[in-house]
């Protein structure tokens, strides 16, 4: 079981923990060997105390048990006579966050240990390009986030403020849009999104590459790569190459680093050099017709990153075509 | 070292009300639970009632239960027997006693000198 | 109620003999059973808890075995001291319930 968690030590007896929703987590505490063990875990309120686990007499007790814990605690007890009290807690929702303690008691002292339990999430967030009659717009969305994160938007490396949030959710999890107007823009752009809890940071970066203007039956190469900055080389990440037309976007290939598979949807599209290096998505479009003219645009995300890149294509009837008019 | 010391037992009549209290020191209070036991004139022992160290859980004997209320101060140290509508067979001395730990242990490691509780018209 | 039962009633030994006391619970309690020595006109001692473990500070002479509904107190080497009442108490479920009462006495 893989347990998302992160330990931070404050002072009395007071330990943060993080974990993320939905998932599983371990609320330690642990005490001096002794016999007579008897242990409580307690979730304390605002008003009330309520029984998370209880073991004592040998054996884990569940009587008092508050329904909102049940089948999702147990402890080590295997290890309880090791010393460790620790509470195994599944799937973790934002209810759950909040001050727990855990009680020990032996034959020879009794002590309690205080844990605060904080919950995160943050579902990949991801960048989108819309065309709306005729205006362009990038769409920043995270569909799932708790606490509210921090979203900057930057200009050719310059910080902008102008953007419109939308946000549903009102206790959390939140879905949030943030959308920027960049019609007739040339700049590149950038969405930073923040989860300060979890110290999780996203990035969705835009760029606008220069018009390609081309002949009928002629090919043309799209360039996209991979940077460095950006993607660390153990990093899974996902290439998708589509068209934008009339505001809908269609696959033309799709690339999975962790399988290092390939789907093509255009036959006439293929990549521009082999991926050995898994860092240049730079395309081919052969036997171009007036029909391709129209925005391209490359797709690379990673849990971390976004990096879009537009390409628009204008196909011009070729002379004899032309002149055969 | 750890103390216990019971006080409020006296002569009440038969149907009226008493509460008695138990202060405690040398140990941390709010760790332990804390119960009432009583034993009447030559008689055997017998457990009254129990609240734990965080006042969260209280138990009672079938023979007291709905007339004492056990409840606990942890800010002074404090446990306390509120007993109402007494009988002639509640008369006996009192003694508070520290559970091993929280009160769920359910045996007695320290015992008050106890307090002496006479129910007769 | 778990009824716990104590024989004998009373016991009369001498100085240095090995003496048992008996309690047997109406139904299975485990472990969870304590015994208390009670001095005249004083609060009760704990001496033994979960059937057979010795209290911190008293002495070896004391011990205490058995499981489930058979236990039984032994003092290996009886001495003036421990003139008392001894009881046994069980701790498996509410409500806690003692013997009633076993009446040492010194020949």
């Known amino acids: 079981i893989f347990l998302s968690a992160f330990f931070t030590y404050v002072p009395m007896n007071e330990q943060i923990i993080i974990g993320r929703l939905g998932e599983d987590i371990i609320l330690p505490s642990s005490f001096e060997r002794g016999s007579e063990v008897v242990i409580h875990w307690k979730y304390q309120d605002s008003y009330n105390s309520y029984n998370v686990h209880s073991y004592y007499k040998g054996s884990g007790r569940l009587e008092s048990q508050d329904t909102r814990y049940a089948n999702r605690t147990s402890l080590f007890y295997n290890e309880i006579q090791n010393g460790n009290a620790s509470l195994f807690f599944r799937r973790l929702s934002l209810l759950d966050e909040g001050i727990y303690t855990c009680y020990v008691g032996t034959a020879i002292q009794a002590i309690t240990n205080k844990v605060v339990l904080k919950v995160g999430v943050f579902l990949t967030p991801m960048m989108k390009y819309e065309k709306r009659n005729t205006n362009s717009f990038l769409i920043c969305n995270v569909l799932s986030v708790y606490p509210r994160p921090i979203i900057t938007w930057k200009m050719d490396n310059t910080p902008i403020s102008e953007n419109n949030m939308q946000e549903t959710g009102s206790l959390g999890p939140f879905s949030i849009n943030s959308t920027l107007n960049i019609t007739g823009s040339n700049s590149s752009y950038e969405c930073t999104i923040e989860n300060s809890l979890l110290k999780q940071t996203w990035t969705g970066r835009w760029t606008m590459k220069d018009g390609l203007h081309k002949m009928q039956s002629e090919h043309v190469s799209l360039s996209c790569e991979l940077v460095n900055d950006y993607f660390s080389p153990n990093q899974d990440f996902k290439v998708t190459w589509s068209r934008m037309e009339s505001g809908i976007s269609s696959i033309l290939a799709y690339y999975l680093s962790s399988s290092q598979n390939t789907t093509f949807y255009e036959s006439r599209f293929s990549w521009n050099k082999e991926l050995k290096n898994q860092s240049d998505f730079s395309m081919n479009l052969t036997d171009l017709s007036l029909s391709d003219s129209g925005e391209y645009l490359c797709n690379i995300s990673s849990d971390e990153y976004t990096l879009l890149t537009i390409h628009t294509v204008h196909v011009e009837p070729s002379q004899e075509t032309a002149s055969d008019n | 070292q750890v103390q216990l010391v019971e006080s409020g037992g006296g002569v009440v009549q038969p149907g009226r009300s008493l509460r008695l209290s138990c202060a405690a020191s040398g140990f941390t209070f709010s760790d332990y639970g804390i119960h009432w036991v009583r034993q009447a004139p030559g008689k055997g022992l017998e457990w009254v009632a129990v609240?734990?160290?965080?006042?969260?859980?209280?138990y009672y004997a079938d023979s007291v239960r709905g007339r004492f209320t056990i409840s606990r101060d942890n800010s002074k140290n404090t446990l306390s027997l509120q007993m109402n509508s007494l009988r002639a067979e509640d008369t006996a001395v009192y003694y508070c006693?520290?559970?091993?730990?929280?009160?769920?242990?359910?045996?007695?490691?320290?015992w008050g000198q106890g307090t002496l509780v006479t129910v007769s018209s | 109620d778990i009824q716990m039962t104590q024989s004998p009633s009373t016991l009369s030994a001498s100085v240095g003999d090995r003496v048992t006391i008996t309690c047997r619970a109406s139904q299975s309690i485990s472990s969870w059973l304590a015994w208390y020595q009670q001095k005249p006109g004083k609060a009760p001692k704990l001496l033994i808890y979960k059937a057979s473990s010795l209290e911190s500070g008293v002495p070896s002479r004391f011990s205490g075995s058995g499981s489930g509904t058979e236990f039984t107190l032994t003092i290996s080497s009886l001495q003036p001291d421990d003139l008392a009442t001894y009881y046994c108490q069980q701790y498996n479920s509410y409500s806690y319930t003692f013997g009633q009462g076993t009446k040492l006495e010194i020949k």
């Open positions: 006693a520290r559970d091993r730990s929280s009160g769920a242990m359910g045996y007695f490691a320290y």
């Open positions: 609240i734990w160290y965080d006042g969260s859980d209280k």
